[in-house]
């Protein structure tokens, strides 16, 4: 598979790797989300491991307010991180592909 | 980097690999989008290479109606594909992680 197709596959499989641990197997509860972030997105998390930060993040992702993060909410989250990465990327011209 | 972080990096770098070819270097025009889809998401495209299908897809992605696809619109598109993959994934219990 092409790199982008592999990337999408990783997005899906990573979600289910953690959503399948407790409760609803198609949703991430707070502890599952915490584990996913700690293990799979350590660069995003950095040192923000305090409880309030996790609660805020969970609340921001949980648009339907069911105390869990479903796959659509997770995709929105990853898109937000990708957009942050993109802003960083666009801010460093020497790291960009050739100019048009 | 962890697989999910690599996946996000691929999302960003793939966009710029094609957006950097013509016109606005931070947006995909129709020909750039067509090339990205053909080369990077062949499984998604399948045999849908007719012009009308591309025009329709471009129109659906171009939410701000500027005839180009910016990074946010591209992320929405990838999220939609990921959600389709996820529906497929959830439909095959034998391919899922262990039950809760």
């Amino acid at each position: 598979a092409c790199p982008l197709e592999k990337a999408l596959d990783v997005m899906v499989s990573t979600f289910h790797k953690y959503s399948g641990k407790e409760g609803d197997k198609f949703k991430l509860n707070k502890s599952e989300l915490k584990e996913l972030l700690t293990r799979e997105l350590p660069s995003f998390l950095g040192k923000r491991t305090d409880e309030a930060a996790f609660q805020k993040l969970m609340s921001n992702l949980d648009s339907n307010r069911d105390n869990e993060v479903d796959f659509q909410e997770y995709c929105v989250f990853l898109s937000c991180i990708a957009m942050m990465c993109n802003e960083f990327f666009e801010g460093f011209p020497d790291k960009q592909p050739r100019k048009k | 980097a962890c697989p999910l972080e690599k996946a996000l990096d691929v999302m960003v770098s793939t966009f710029h690999k094609y957006s950097g070819k013509e016109g606005d270097k931070f947006k995909l025009n129709k020909s750039e989008l067509k090339e990205l889809l053909t080369r990077e998401l062949p499984s998604f495209l399948g045999k849908r290479t007719d012009e009308a299908a591309f025009q329709k897809l471009m129109s659906n992605l171009d939410s701000n109606r500027d005839n180009e696809v910016d990074f946010q619109e591209y992320c929405v598109f990838l999220s939609c594909i990921a959600m389709m993959c996820n529906e497929f994934f959830e439909g095959f219990p034998d391919k899922q992680p262990r039950k809760k």
Epitope: G23, A52, Q55, S59, N60, S63, N64, R65, N67 | -
Partner: antibody, heavy 120, light 107 residues
Framework: QVQLQESGPGLVKPSQTLSLTCTVS?????????WNWIRQHPGSKLEWIGH???????NYNPSLKNRLSMSRDTSKNQFSLKLSSVTAADTAVYYC?????????????WGQGTLVTVSS | DIQMTQSPSSLSASVGDRVTITCRAS??????LNWYQQKPGKAPKLLLY???RLHSGVPSRFSGSGSGTDYTLTISSLQPEDFATYYC?????????FGGGTKVEIK
């Protein structure tokens, strides 16, 4: 200390639109919280109306959804409620509340409430 | 919608008494249960969230327990300022719903 203050007319005629505004002070109107409307009917029953939160995400009580509209103005630290086609059954004390980001999303701060009477 | 049923609807007690109020949900609410106290003419105030976590500034005589569909609020030693109406509320799913209230009166 977070404070919420409801404002709006205390008397609304049947079939008209009830409009209320809540002003938040002592806390920036941040994305970390959802901002709610809750009403209490004369018999003391509490009813959740709806809320507005992260990225402008809005959820309404399905029982009121087709008559409801909520919005916010972050520059003024305000959020608003509009309830159309009111009847006597909409007579209640209306509270604006802040929904915490903790487990179960409790309502941790409340306005003092404003009585709205629907009568001709 | 999830229905919340409180019992009793009212009770009489004396200062120093141990008081227990129960709340039953129509389905499992996974401990996402909050309790509020309301005095006449005032807005409700948060006491406990997520079944048993005390909101800041709430005295430790208030405690909560339960799981699944059945939850309890306990006041270990009733104080004069505790005479009020108590409401449970589920935070498990939308729409948020409240119990009918339990009025605690002086015996």
């Amino acid at each position: 200390q977070v404070q919420l203050q409801e404002s709006g007319p205390g008397l609304v005629k049947p079939s008209q639109t009830l409009s209320l505004t809540c002003t938040v002070s002592g806390d920036s109107f941040t994305n970390d919280y959802y901002w709610n409307w809750i009403r209490q009917h004369p018999g003391s029953k509490l009813e959740w109306i709806g809320h507005i939160g992260y990225g402008g995400n809005i959820n309404y009580n399905p029982s009121l959804k087709n008559r409801l509209s909520m919005s916010r103005d972050t520059s003024k630290n305000q959020f608003s409620l509009k309830l159309s086609s009111v009847t006597a059954a909409d007579t209640a004390v209306y509270y604006c509340t802040r929904e915490s980001f903790y487990d179960g999303y409790p309502f941790d701060y409340w306005g003092q409430g404003t009585l709205v009477t629907v009568s001709s | 919608d999830i229905q919340m049923t409180q019992s009793p609807s009212s009770l009489s007690a004396s200062v120093g008494d141990r008081v227990t109020i129960t709340c039953r949900a129509s389905q499992d609410i996974r401990n996402y249960l909050n309790w509020y106290q309301q005095k006449p003419g005032k807005a409700p105030k948060l006491l406990l969230y997520y079944t048993s976590r005390l909101h800041s500034g709430v005295p430790s005589r208030f405690s909560g327990s339960g799981s699944g569909t059945d939850y309890t609020l306990t006041i270990s030693s009733l104080q004069p300022e505790d005479f009020a109406t108590y409401y449970c509320q589920q935070g498990n799913s939308l729409p948020r719903t409240f119990g009918g209230g339990t009025k605690v009166e002086i015996k």
